[in-house]
Structure formats: C-alpha cells, structure tokens
C-alpha cells in the first residue's frame, strides 16, 4: 500500500508526511500554505523541484511560466519531455514530470493569461494527460466553464497529442504546426492556442512572424502576442480516468 500522511492531531485535522510529498496538493493537505519551491517525488519517479501555488482551492503545481522572453521555448521533443528553464523565472516543467504527478487521474488545468494592458484571464479545464505512448495527449474530460472554452480546445473526449518541430503529432496532415509556428504544444489545427510560442516584447508588423507568438485565439485573438502566461495542474482526488 502507498504510504499515507499520518494524522497527528485529529481534532485539528493536521497530518504529517514522513516522505517527500507526491505533489503540491498533498503538501496543502498536510498544512503547508506558503507558495514556493518544493522537492516532490511522485510514485515511481525520482525527486524533482516544483513551484507550488497554494490557494483557497488547494495546492497547484506550476507547469509553465512565461513573462519576459528570457528562455527559448523553441526546443525539440526531448527538451519538452524532460523540462527546461529556470524555476525562479521562465520554465517548462517537463511532460514526463507532469505525467508522473497526474498518473492516470483526471486533473484540473488552470491557465492564467495576461496581455500588455494589464488585463488578465483565468481559464480552468478538466483534463486527462496521457503518457509518452500517447505523445502526452491532452483530453478534455468535462465541459469548460466560461466564455472562452468552446473554440479554444478540442470537444470533450477528443485527445490532442503534444507536438514539437521534430515530433509532429498534430491533427493536420498538410502541416507541421510546431515548425510553422514555434515551440511545442498540443496543436490541433495550429490556430487555437500556443502558450509556448515565440516571446515578442513588441508586436512585429509582419503577420507571418506574428503567428509564431504566444496566443490564445478566443481571448485576445490569433495575432496578439501575450505578455505573460502561467499553467498550473492539480490532480483530482482518487478517481482515475475512465
């Protein structure tokens, strides 16, 4: 049986954990309320460092952060699998690490977007992330709440594999989305979103260049390069994906 957190004070529902936490949510469950860097060790995985964001909704693991263009996100499959960047700055946690956190559980995926005028948007999805054998396919497992969902992600039940310029798994036969855009992403038809695109500090004039940027079509439009993005994941309790 997996080692569980041991209750030490049932009256106050405080628990102790005598191993590294499996994820940020488990840290939250044993009373950690300070966001920041923690070493975690999901089952069957070596330990690794993550950014935990503690909120009223529990503990979330930050899996992506962009805000200044300091890190090149136009990288091959192995980089997206392993992760890259600076945990204190811009980074991609790594598909294998994210999958080790979620396992076969459904998860909540939160996406925070910010434009250059200080406007922000928060989107939440219920998702399931497959393993490398599925090219880390992202499947929507429940309808998306809010205005932006419908045209942003695949219909509920459809899986979209992850793609990079050297591993083309997108849903277009005639095009390599990662190559014609930039970075690795769950590309469907190339045009809905790409939060791992090229970072632009100023908006380029040529549309051909613009399309390579960081965008979320249903929020600020296909050709608006966003200023900052953060992606966070939180596995849901116990229930496995069907």
């Amino acid at each position: 049986l997996p080692e569980m957190a041991q209750p030490v004070d049932p009256a106050h529902n405080v628990s102790r954990l005598h191993r590294l936490p499996r994820d940020c949510q488990e840290l939250f469950q044993v009373g950690e309320r300070q966001s920041g860097l923690f070493e975690i060790q999901p089952q069957g995985s070596p330990p690794f460092l993550v950014n935990c964001k503690m909120t009223s909704d529990g503990g979330w693991t930050v899996i992506q952060r962009r805000h200044d263009g300091s890190v090149d996100f136009n990288r091959p499959w192995e980089a997206y699998k392993a992760g890259f960047g600076d945990p204190h700055g811009e980074f991609w946690l790594g598909l294998e690490k994210v999958h080790s956190i979620t396992g076969d559980r459904n998860s909540r995926l939160a996406v925070q977007l910010r434009d250059w005028d200080g406007n922000a948007e928060l989107l939440q999805f219920s998702v399931h992330l497959g393993g490398e054998d599925t090219a880390y396919s992202l499947q929507l497992t429940a309808p998306v709440a809010g205005q932006l969902g419908a045209t942003t992600v695949p219909p509920s039940g459809l899986s979209v594999p992850f793609s990079t310029w050297d591993q083309d798994h997108d849903l277009r036969r005639d095009k390599n989305c990662a190559k014609s855009l930039s970075g690795g992403w769950w590309f469907g038809t190339c045009s809905h979103s790409n939060l791992n695109g090229q970072y632009f500090r100023s908006i380029p004039q040529q549309r051909q260049k613009l399309k390579k940027g960081i965008f979320w079509k249903t929020w600020r439009g296909r050709y608006y390069p966003l200023q900052a993005t953060t992606m966070l994941i939180q596995p849901m309790a116990a229930e496995a994906a069907s």
Epitope: L17, P21, E32
Partner: nanobody, 126 residues
Framework: EVQLVESGGGLVQPGGSLRLSCAAS???????????MGWFRQAPGKEREFVAA????????PYADSVKGRFAISRDNAKNTLTLQMNSLKPEDTAVYYC????????????????WGQGTQVTVSS
Amino acid sequence: EVQLVESGGGLVQPGGSLRLSCAASGRTFSTFNTYSMGWFRQAPGKEREFVAAISRSGNVTPYADSVKGRFAISRDNAKNTLTLQMNSLKPEDTAVYYCAASKIGIASTIRYYDYWGQGTQVTVSS
C-alpha cells in the same frame, strides 16, 4: 553571517541512542521558520548522503530508507534549533552528521541546501 552548530555526537554501542542538536544563529536566521532544515551524513570514503529533512511548518519530514523508523527529526522555531533523535543505532550509522538549511520548502537533495554546519562525529561501535 549564518552559523549552524551541531552538537551531541559521540561514541555509542550498537542498539544505543544519541540526540543531535543544531543551533542556528546569525542575522539571516532571525526568521528560522522560513527555512526548511535537514540532516546529512558522510562516512569515511563515501559521499555525503541525505538522512532526514523537515519543512518550515514541521508537517513534512522525509527520511532516508536506511533510517526510517529509527531516527526522528524535529524543530523548535522559537529556539532556532533542529534535533535528530537517533535510536537503535547500527555500525553503518557511523559518520560525520551535518545540519543544513534550505530556502526550498522541503528537499532531500544536497544541492538545494544553502547553509551547512561543520558536522559532529557519530561512532557506533562495541
């Protein structure tokens, strides 16, 4: 200047117990509870290895498999002290034991520790 000073080491027979303490001082440690703390050990001719760690709140206390159930780590944030209670000691526990502090919330990996003590010798022998 941050200072970590270990004490409590010594010679003990197999099956015996020892209690190691680590006192933290210095301007940076006016907020001791903003650091996670850990114990590491280094036996002659071997690499330094993780023993146990404790989060800022004290609720997360990972242990190396080799000491689980025998050692207990604790902290007193009011007194800026870290403690390692070592029971059922074995000859293979012989090593220099180091106290360390990290800005990471919890960690078992050496490179995530910023401050180190000088170490205290523990010898388990009959």
